[in-house]
């Protein structure tokens, strides 16, 4: 690495993956092992994140980018950058302080995380229940009874509908 010769801040020429070493006359030095700098002109390198315990490494740390973690099987990420791991539950359950519990009647959860949510109330849209809900699945709404012609074997979903029972978790 060459000594920087900038008329302004000599450190501005230090690229990502290096730091401006004040102890060595502001020479651009490579980041030490297990550290990184994602932008140029930095005076220190940041310590790499370590994915330990319930976290596992999704992307290794490099000299220019931090490690990225996800969760071991049976857990899922929460928070920005997977800052926490939370236990998975089965579909039809929600996580409580006492562990995974089945959804109460009239609620469902089609995910391995998140809470049990009430079934859709089809009548709010003037529609009828086409398929009953379960603890794993929401009800399916169909056209209003008045829309059904005699002998109609099936109906289409109400206007554009929303997607799988995913609710933000």
């Amino acid at each position: 690495f060459e000594r920087t010769r900038s008329l302004q801040d000599p450190c501005s020429n230090c690229p990502a993956g290096t730091f401006c070493d004040n102890n060595r006359n502001q020479i651009c030095s490579p980041c030490p092992p297990n550290s990184f700098s994602s932008a140029g002109g930095q005076r220190t390198c940041d310590i790499c994140r370590q994915c330990k315990g319930v976290f596992r490494t999704r992307k290794e740390c490099s000299s220019t980018s931090n490690a990225e973690c996800d969760c071991t099987p049976g857990f899922h990420c929460l928070g920005a950058g997977c800052s926490m791991c939370e236990q998975d539950c089965k579909q039809g359950q929600e996580l409580t302080k006492k562990g995974c519990k089945d959804c109460c009647f009239g609620t469902f959860n089609d995910q391995k995380r998140g809470i049990c949510r009430p079934w859709t109330n089809c009548s709010l849209d003037g529609k009828s229940v086409l398929v009953n809900g379960t603890k794993e699945r929401d009800v399916v709404c169909g056209p209003s009874p008045a829309d059904l012609s005699p002998g109609a074997s099936s109906v289409t979903p109400p206007a554009p509908a929303r997607e799988p029972g995913h609710s933000p978790q």
């Epitope: 899922h76 579909q91 039809g92 469902f108 089609d110 995910q111 391995k112 995380r113 949510r117 009430p118 079934w119 859709t120 109330n121 709010l124 849209d125 086409l130 398929v131 794993e136 699945r137 929401d138 399916v140 709404c141 099936s154 979903p157 109400p158 206007a159 554009p160 509908a161 929303r162 997607e163 799988p164 029972g165 995913h166 609710s167 933000p168 978790q169």
Partner: antibody, heavy 127, light 110 residues
Amino acid sequence: EVQLLESGGGLVQPGGSLRLSCAASGFTFSGYDMSWVRQAPGKCLEWVSVIYPDDGNTYYADSVKGRFTISRDNSKNTLYLQMNSLRAEDAAVYYCAKHGGQKPTTKSSSAYGMDGWGQGTLVTVSS
Amino acid sequence: QSVLTQPPSASGTPGQRVTISCSGSSSNIGNNYVTWYQQLPGTAPKLLIYADSHRPSGVPDRFSGSKSGTSASLAISGLRSEDEADYYCATWDYSLSGYVFGCGTKLTVL
């Protein structure tokens, strides 16, 4: 009538980036889940990502996690897919798809399927 | 390889009834709704069946869907030449936290 128009496809080198857009009309965009689905030439359909309108919650296929980012601008009726670190296996026609089941009344849209599709935009990844 | 298994091809003569299967597991088909799509050559997919067995308006009643356990089926009766297309099953998979498609069945009308 539901209309979805994708754009932004093209030729990009491995490791490069592209941003796809999908302009929606003919329905209340802010009330529906939206997905990207791709299809490599002569291959199967592969779901890529979904975004919900209410909470902005997103899900991704394992094959694109950490590289692709789905987003939406409800004020512009537009869906986006930012694709970084592109690989040869990402080459495909990318479709924008609208889910059935309008929110917030409908709690889950999985039952209703993807009831509106764009014509697709071709992404080629080659050096 | 797809999480949902479909036969790669199926065929029939005009007027016949053909059935296309889709096999999965308890984390997808077993506990979630199945949808079916038709993709005519050179076009985008079109929703054919939702919520296991229901047709959107405009889809002929020659198309029907059913589900039992961790498998689903699409039946097409009174086969027509315009039914020649690729047919895909799809559902939500809670363990993957994502949608999954079968790899499609190419239907040929002989």
